[in-house]
């Protein structure tokens, strides 16, 4: 269901109350007008729990390329440059919506699709687990 | 314009170059079949960075509701529990897709728009600008 | 008018390191993956590597990883490649080509205009 | 790596002529990508996605294949046509190119 009034200018809907297959407009409205200076792509390096991007690319989804965090240690990086494994080095993770050709090569057909990505990685201290 | 074999079962396409105007199916595909045990939800608790969520909810977008993170402090979190503020809490934040409905109030008519989220926090070291 | 727009050529010794930069202009920049090919002298196009300027990613062909880092600036929408170690095979056009990260079935579809490196004692 | 050849690797043919250029991979791939490059010029994309034409490319150009095997064809060729043309995979990495096949005026 969705807000009305409805606008009388929407393209027609076979079922109004939930649609299940939309018309979507592929030319990407970015809402990130300007370049935000406190965005910094350089925090896989400079993290305590520092990651790797790591570059996975599917043709049949839109978008083809992602590319994923894999966190480098276990451990966190102390001050001086060595690993401390008395914390984790943990992958933050997010569900994102992408989209799925199908059927498969249509250029023009795709249906929608929940996948987990890594985005970055945190410094967490472990859950120790006592033993009575 | 797409890969070959193209499908023969596949909508029609008015520009085959580069469709801009796509059908998309609703029903969400999740990838991720099983909860993945490693993935918690209490990192932004536990982490030396950690976070607050903030619930983003906005009707005429698909997904209506995005939970966003807000680092809790400037500085890192020491095994003391102090906050360490030779180091920074900042956000790691990705460029995700979502649809806008287009116009507003159609059910069944939108557009793909890239939006920035803060899905957690990582504690970095600063960088330091020394004055000559 | 989208535009790829590559330094000038380099002449350098061997053992030392060079950096091409790439600006680009007439389209978002961060939409793109920027990719880097080299043609050394009448022979084939040999691909190095990609970055993604929006998540300051890598990727290398093994052959140059550990030689060359590719680079990203948001803020000037320029794209860098510094080949280091270099050496007399070395010698070849650089060229910087975008690719569309969200619909890669459009492959790499414009180029720079290619940077001479000479590398030569 | 995957090892594309392309045969012929020059071609001496005449205006008006059909050609045909073929390009073989090692092991299997998803999709073949040709670019045309002319001497002292950046390579430009001509087909993609195996079939797809680039923008502004003649419609007497065509690209096919599936697999191992793929092929370029130009049923007519036309003076602006002689140059070099290299195919390209990006199904494996590394990424690679075909040695390339330059197209001459008999």
């Known amino acids: 269901g969705i807000a009305i009034p409805r606008n009388s200018g929407c393209p027609n809907s076979e079922d109004k109350n939930f649609p299940r297959t939309v018309m979507v407009n592929l030319n990407i409205h970015n809402r990130n007008t300007s370049t935000n200076p406190k965005r910094s792509s350089d925090y896989y390096n400079r993290s305590t729990s520092p990651w790797n991007l790591h570059r996975n690319e599917d043709p049949e989804r839109y978008p083809s390329v992602i590319w994923e965090a894999k966190c480098r240690h276990l451990g966190c990086v102390k001050a001086d440059g060595n690993v401390d494994y008395h914390m984790n080095s943990v992958p933050i993770q997010q569900e994102i919506l992408v989209l799925r050709r199908e059927p498969r090569h249509c250029p023009n057909s795709f249906r929608l699709e929940k996948i987990l990505v890594s985005v970055g990685c945190t410094c967490v201290t472990p859950i120790v687990h006592h033993v009575a | 314009g797409i890969a070959i074999p193209r499908n023969s079962g596949c909508p029609n396409s008015e520009d085959k170059n580069f469709p801009r105007t796509v059908m998309v199916n609703l029903n969400i595909h999740n990838r991720n079949t099983s909860t993945n045990p490693k993935r918690s939800s209490d990192y932004y608790n536990r982490s030396t960075s950690p976070w607050n969520l903030h619930r983003n909810e906005d009707p005429e977008r698909y997904p209506s509701v995005i939970w966003e993170a807000k680092c809790r402090h400037l500085g890192c979190v020491k095994a003391d529990g102090n906050v360490d503020y030779h180091m920074n809490s900042v956000p790691i934040q990705q460029e995700i897709l979502v649809l806008r409905r287009e116009p507003r109030h159609c059910p069944n008519s939108f557009r793909l728009e890239k939006i920035l989220v803060s899905v957690g926090c990582t504690c970095v070291t600063p960088i330091v600008h020394h004055v000559a | 008018e989208v535009q790829l727009v590559q330094s000038g050529a380099e002449v350098k010794k061997p053992g030392s390191s060079v950096k091409v930069s790439c600006k680009a202009s007439?389209?978002?920049?961060?939409?793109?993956?920027i990719h880097w090919v080299r043609q050394a002298p009448g022979q084939g196009l040999e691909w190095i590597g990609v970055n993604d300027p929006e998540s300051g990613g890598t990727f290398y062909n093994q052959k140059f990883d550990g030689r060359a880092t590719l680079t990203a600036d948001k803020s000037t929408s320029t794209a860098y490649m510094e080949l280091s170690s270099l050496r007399s095979e070395d010698t070849a056009v650089y060229y910087c080509?975008?690719?569309?990260?969200?619909?890669?079935?459009?492959?790499?579809?414009?180029w720079g205009q290619g940077t001479t490196v000479t590398v030569s004692s | 790596d995957i090892q594309l050849t392309q045969s012929p690797s020059s071609l001496s043919a005449s205006v008006g002529d059909r050609v045909t250029i073929t390009c073989s991979a090692s092991s299997s791939i998803s999709y073949i990508y040709w670019f045309q490059q002319k001497p002292g010029k950046s390579p430009k994309r001509w087909i993609y996605a195996t079939f797809e034409l680039a923008s502004g490319v003649p419609s007497r150009f065509s690209g096919s294949g599936s697999g191992t095997d793929y092929t370029l064809t130009i049923s007519s060729l036309q003076p602006e046509d002689f140059a070099t043309y290299y195919c390209?995979?990006?199904?494996?990495?590394?990424?690679?190119f075909g040695q390339g096949t330059k197209l001459e005026i008999k």
């Open positions: 007439g389209y978002t920049f961060t939409d793109y993956e």
């Open positions: 080509t975008r690719y569309y990260r969200y619909e890669s079935f459009y492959g790499m579809d414009y």
């Open positions: 390209h995979q990006r199904s494996s990495y590394p990424w690679t």
